[in-house]
Amino acid sequence: PEPPTACREKQYLINSQCCSLCQPGQKLVSDCTEFTETECLPCGESEFLDTWNRETHCHQHKYCDPNLGLRVQQKGTSETDTICTCEEGWHCTSEACESCVLHRSCSPGFGVKQIATGVSDTICEPCPVGFFSNVSSAFEKCHPWTSCETKDLVVQQAGTNKTDVVCGPQDRLRA
């Protein structure tokens, strides 16, 4: 019979014959022959392969370097790599998470629209009319101005995006 020019899924062509790929979590020790199956071996501790493969070496699990502010979010297996994240208060610089960035704070006049996570930074928004923020914070939203009327008071000083209104007593008309 004609030697194959293409192989089925999860197979590879070698020496004019189709051999089975090694399953995830295993590496290739020896190709198949006319008489033997592909020989595969499980990846060692702290190693992985995440695809059907013909690799002769497993990949090392990623090291989450605490010096870089990294910690393990999900421990690797023989089939998956370790997933790193950043310590509290910091987030990954990129998807690869090889270093960390300090969460930014929202300046006075801005409030937190979205709190930072391990993979994304704080998102700030300007405080709209009627709201203020007088602190630099990674958590605080814009606060609504105090309603003087509900306290039976009047506005003595208008609020801004950075300051609350100042309420005061209503002037009483003297008899």
């Epitope: 370097d65 502010g69 208060g89 610089t93 990129s94 998807e95 090889e98």
Partner: antibody
């Protein structure tokens, strides 16, 4: 070997702008933030801001917020710091510095002189 | 902004003698995650700054072990057990607890 190579010295007129470059090599550019720190003659260090090349997300020191723009070009692994409306007090050495577990690598510095 | 204050501003030392630089922050640099975000840099004459100590007490790679860092939330010390001629330069402390990042004014170490 990680290297940060900055552009050459500049002499500028008051009111003009300057753009300093910092070319990174020896590591994955998008995996670390790039910061800019300046040092006026005989003075200390002052942080200006940074760019995250992965997201193109900058963060500025409010002191410079309206005058500084930090950008990054992923294709050339180069970070840029542009400072506008220059005044004599902006005369300084400008450094780029990579943030790893600290400012672990620094550029050689770019001297910017503002003089009429 | 967090204010970083160093003392002394000038430090003449005899080679072989110990040296100590103090740095005080206007706010505690101890984060709720347990780390203290205080860093020490040395700027040798005509050079860019270089890292000595990170997170208050961890010695950076390649830095001689005669350098050490210690402190609490707001008071920090950089110690050199035996000063050598190559240690001359300006020492800066820096906080990275929050933006803007801020540095101390610097301490100039010179050989007597």
């Amino acid at each position: 070997e990680v290297q940060l190579v900055q552009s050459g010295a500049e002499v500028k007129k008051p009111g003009s702008s300057v753009k300093v470059s910092c070319k990174a090599s020896g590591y994955t550019f998008t995996s670390y933030t790039m910061h800019w720190v300046r040092q006026a003659p005989g003075q200390g260090l002052e942080w200006m801001g940074y760019i995250n090349p992965s997201s193109d997300y900058p963060n500025y020191n409010q002191k410079f917020k309206d005058r500084v723009t930090i950008t990054a070009d992923k294709s050339t692994s180069t970070a840029y710091m542009e400072l506008s409306s220059l005044r004599s007090e902006d005369t300084a050495v400008y450094y780029c510095a990579r943030w790893g577990y600290s400012f672990d690598y620094w550029g050689q510095g770019t001297t910017v002189t503002v003089s009429s | 902004d967090i204010v970083m204050t160093q003392s002394p501003l000038s430090l003449p030392v005899t080679p072989g003698e110990p040296a100590s630089i103090s740095c005080r922050s206007s706010k505690s640099l101890l984060h709720s995650n347990g780390n203290t975000y205080l860093y020490w840099y040395l700027q040798k004459p005509g050079q860019s700054p270089q890292l000595l100590i990170y997170r208050m007490s961890t010695l950076a790679s390649g830095v001689p072990d005669r350098f050490s860092g210690s402190g609490s939330g707001t008071d920090f010390t950089l110690k050199i057990s035996r000063v050598e001629a190559e240690d001359v330069g300006v020492y800066y402390c820096m906080q990275h607890l929050e933006y803007p990042l801020t540095f101390g004014q610097g301490t100039k170490l010179e050989i007597k």
